[in-house]
């Protein structure tokens, strides 16, 4: 059974992940970002189901493509280089989902834009945080 300290740690990690994803979304949606139109042409893949921490496997598998698309945006839109930003997210995701069980992600048939993709994972974080608090 999860202890209060482990629940608190999970909550803090999710909040950190949430902030990172929101920061990316804000950088992309920045009205000064001339790249938004181009960035929206790139396709992302969404999980069929995302209700548990193990489903973060689906986010982890799309982090490389996310970094590629962020590389298109002017670096001044973000506080960190895309590589560092994605590396930070990757570390949190690995800790949150755990490495004990190997979960095979199932993806939805429809693709998503980068904005839809980020919003989906932001909602996921918010949803899990609300169950922990």
């Amino acid at each position: 059974a999860p202890t209060s300290s482990s629940t608190k740690k999970t909550q803090l990690q999710l909040e950190h992940l949430l902030l990172d994803l929101q920061m990316i979304l804000n950088g992309i949606n920045n009205y000064k970002n001339p790249k938004l139109t181009r960035m929206l042409t790139f396709k992302f893949y969404m999980p069929k189901k995302a209700t548990e921490l193990k489903h973060l496997q689906c986010l982890e598998e799309e982090l490389k493509p996310l970094e590629e698309v962020l590389n298109l945006a002017q670096s001044k839109n973000f506080h960190l280089r895309p590589r560092d930003l994605i590396s930070n997210i990757n570390v949190i995701v690995l800790e949150l989902k755990g490495s004990e069980t190997t979960f095979m992600c199932e993806y939805a048939d429809e693709t998503a834009t980068i904005v839809e993709f980020l919003n989906r994972w932001i909602t996921f974080c918010q949803s899990i945080i609300s169950t922990l608090t």
Partner: antibody
Framework: EIQLQQSGPELRRPGSSVKLSCKAS????????IHWVRHRPEHGLEWIGW????????RYAQKFQSKATLTADTSSNAAYMQLSSLTPEDTATYFC??????????????WGQGTLVTVSS | DIVMTQSPFSLAVSEGEMVTINCKSS????????????LAWYQQKPGQSPKLLIY???TGQSGVPDRFIGSGSGTDFTLTISDVQAEDLADYYC?????????FGAGTKLELK
């Protein structure tokens, strides 16, 4: 028909610089990234970098960071690459290329005919 | 950077033979979301620009003869040319087109016996 037309061969002295051009036709240059690739027979193909002609944003392979400068001119639908501080090792054919479609950055599907740059004293 | 290890360096063949060229990447090129491998094959003849033959490891580019077949997944890929023709004599390169910087294999020279 999509075409990339590159400038003619160049002969340069070591230490000098050269500017190559790549004129696109059959599509609007601002719709896709333009990539540059170097070919040396003994070293094969090497990606130099890309430019987004829409806003001039660039990305370079680390080894070409201080060697190549990519620019674009949307009014003439053309991209350019300047190579500086030339050495005999820069002797190569340089290609510009465009991606297959707009759903990913790569692979390169449309290529210019190449520009041979010879660096010799 | 992802390292692409291509083999063999050169290959001497007779017309009508079948040849295989291998390419190994230092990281997986499989994107789970679409089950596509971001690996392309190019043909380059002397004095010409490279020509895209195969992308996503096995999708033939429009207009490319179907004797060029790409296969493989993850880190191991193969280009097979069945019934080699004289016009196929060229250099062949693999390219990973997943992560910047895109990286090419060292190339394979296909020569006539």
């Amino acid at each position: 028909e999509i075409q990339l037309q590159q400038s003619g061969p160049e002969l340069r002295r070591p230490g000098s610089s050269v500017k190559l051009s790549c004129k696109a036709s059959g599509y609007n240059i601002t719709d896709y990234l333009i990539h540059w690739v170097r070919h040396r027979p003994e070293h094969g193909l090497e990606w130099i970098g890309w430019i987004d002609p829409e806003d001039g944003e660039t990305r370079y392979a680390q080894k070409f960071q201080s060697k190549a400068t990519l620019t674009a001119d949307t009014s003439s639908n053309a991209a350019y690459m300047q190579l500086s501080s030339l050495t005999p090792e820069d002797t190569a054919t340089y290609f510009c290329a465009r991606s297959l479609d707009s759903t990913w950055i790569y692979p390169f599907a449309y290529w210019g005919q190449g520009t041979l740059v010879t660096v010799s004293s | 950077d992802i390292v692409m290890t291509q083999s063999p360096f050169s290959l001497a063949v007779s017309e009508g033979e079948m040849v295989t060229i291998n390419c190994k990447s230092s990281q997986s090129l499989l994107r789970s979301g679409n089950q596509k491998n971001y690996l392309a094959w190019y043909q380059q003849k002397p004095g010409q620009s490279p020509k895209l033959l195969i992308y996503y490891a096995s999708t033939g580019q429009s207009g490319v003869p179907d004797r060029f077949i790409g296969s493989g997944s993850g880190t191991d890929f193969t280009l097979t040319i069945s019934d080699v023709q004289a016009e196929d004599l060229a250099d062949y390169y693999c390219l990973q087109h997943y992560i910047t910087p895109p990286t090419f294999g060292a190339g394979t020279k296909l020569e006539l016996k």
